[in-house]
């Protein structure tokens, strides 16, 4: 009778992460008597995947009933595959021995490769806000994909960006990979409603590329422009002076009126009006009693926007 051979018909198997891998193995004879074991890798450092005789292998099920006397099918299924399961799997026949079973014959091995989708890209912007005309950096990260080939594109409001650097790690062979990209974006005053998008395409994606977004509203600070104007003299010698605070973002703003350098009133922007571009306008007014002043009055509108150093605009009120 011919000597037992261990047949692993599949040289290679490709499986999607999360799915089940079937590793096929048959023996050509029932003799010699002894169990089958499955290993990942060869040599002394090999990893036991399944032992027919003993042990607990929760992710492994056998295709056939190995308790049946005439069974020669030793194929297994490994559930919930991850990229870390990639490797070459060997079906090994042991001969019953005392005290230990003795390795008798090994199959040629089946190489298990795993394809895994990239995680949803995460885009993060700078820690501090920046003003228009400044260049800010955004990063995009996606992890856990295999194979290594991946494309990443950056967009601002649908327009593709070209100023970015991308790295896929690790450089050498690995079970899975990560991508990291940094894009430089020049801010404009109109960017409150703008979005930066990182788009990742990979062979495993059946839909459109995965997208991560960042809203420039979280990055931009548009400083206000100030205009102080004097309204016509009202009854009882009162003058109405207004301070127009225009085109600012975010809304966080505190205004202080100074009369000849002395604080007259402080208020916080509340009932603002929003412009089409997402910036805000606000107006504050001060009633000045002209009869209380003998000399000209210097009125100053001082604005502290979003914790930045105050900006101010003055108006000289003539007392005639």
């Amino acid at each position: 009778e011919e000597e037992l051979q261990v047949i692993q018909p599949d040289k290679s198997v490709l499986v999607a992460a999360g799915e089940t891998a079937t590793l096929r193995c048959t023996a050509t004879s029932l003799i010699p008597v002894g169990p089958i074991q499955w290993f990942r890798g060869a040599g002394p450092g090999r990893e036991l995947i399944y032992n027919q005789k003993e042990g607990h292998f929760p992710r492994v099920t056998t295709v056939s009933d190995l308790t049946k006397r005439n069974n020669m099918d030793f194929s297994i299924r490994i559930g919930n595959i991850t990229p870390a399961d990639a490797g070459t799997y060997y079906c090994v026949k042991f001969r019953k021995g005392s005290p230990d079973d003795v390795e008798f014959k090994s199959g040629a091995g089946t190489e298990l490769s795993v394809r895994a989708k990239p995680s949803a890209p995460v885009v993060s912007g700078p820690a501090a806000r920046a003003t228009p005309q400044h260049t800010v950096s955004f990063t995009c990260e996606s992890h856990g994909f295999s194979p290594r080939d991946i494309t990443l594109k950056w967009f601002k409001n649908g327009n593709e960006l070209s100023d970015f650097q991308t790295n896929v790690d690790p450089v050498g062979e690995s079970v899975s990979y990560s991508i990291h990209s940094t894009a430089k974006v020049v801010l404009t005053r109109e960017d409150v409603h703008s979005q930066v998008i990182c788009e990742v395409a990979h062979v495993t994606l059946q839909g459109d590329p995965l997208r991560g977004t960042a809203n420039l509203s979280e990055t931009i600070r548009v400083p206000p422009t100030l205009e102080v104007t004097q309204q016509p003299v009202r009854a009882e010698n009162q003058v109405n002076v207004t301070c127009q605070v225009r085109k600012f973002y975010p809304q966080r703003l505190q205004l202080t009126w100074l009369e000849n350098g002395n604080v007259s009133r402080t208020e916080t922007a509340s009932t603002v009006t929003e412009n089409k571009d997402g910036t805000y306008n606000w107006m504050s007014w001060l009633l000045v009693n002209v009869s209380a002043h003998r000399d000209d009055v210097k009125l100053t509108c001082q604005v502290e926007h979003d914790g930045q150093p105050a900006v101010s605009k003055s108006h000289d009120l003539k007392v005639s």
């Epitope: 490769s113 991946i150 062979v203 459109d208």
Partner: antibody
Framework: VQLVESGGRLGQPGTPLTLSCTVS????????MGWFRQAPGKGLEYIGI?????SPYYASWVNGRFTISKTSTTMDLKMNSLRSEDTATYFC?????????????WGPGTLVTVSS | DIQMTQSPSSLSASVGDRVTITCRAS??????LAWYQQKPGKAPKLLIY???FLYSGVPSRFSGSGSGTDFTLTISSLQPEDFATYYC???????????FGQGTKVEIK
Amino acid sequence: VQLVESGGRLGQPGTPLTLSCTVSGFSLSSYVMGWFRQAPGKGLEYIGIISSSGSPYYASWVNGRFTISKTSTTMDLKMNSLRSEDTATYFCARVGPLGVDYFNIWGPGTLVTVSS
Amino acid sequence: DIQMTQSPSSLSASVGDRVTITCRASQSINSYLAWYQQKPGKAPKLLIYSASFLYSGVPSRFSGSGSGTDFTLTISSLQPEDFATYYCQSWHYISRSYTFGQGTKVEIK
């Protein structure tokens, strides 16, 4: 799992024609689908795909001549203005579950003949 | 666009012969290559995907190898039902486009 193309017929140059691919046994919202064609006695030619979410992508030569769209159970190929060189058998196919780099299920094809 | 050059364009062989068909890409496509078999009046059938993985139900006499730009389809022992035309197909992960080779017709000697 099955794909069946329909709509192939004799068409006149300059006229539009829409082909359909009806699927069964799986959901079009889970897979990328493609259109291909093969002129008599010639090789296979890629036309375009539609993603699981419904975005079409075309071969560079298409230049707006064809439009791919889909409903829940059918994928359509609209040929805007037939030319004689469009005479071919048109196939629809589904990409494999492991990735978009290969097509594992094909329809039997539908023949389009363009002639005046 | 990537060009796929298949060779030979046709070959004559006998049952039991070992047959090798090659496919060359004009630029690297890594392992994104599939092989199809097509018989007259029929749709293509997938044989090999990702350069070397045998599609389920395909006889083990078919095998694929290669990476980068050069790929091979081998039929270890030609059977009567294998007489057909074979196509390679690439997918380019940057352009996300597909290209076919011009086909290899395997005929009975």
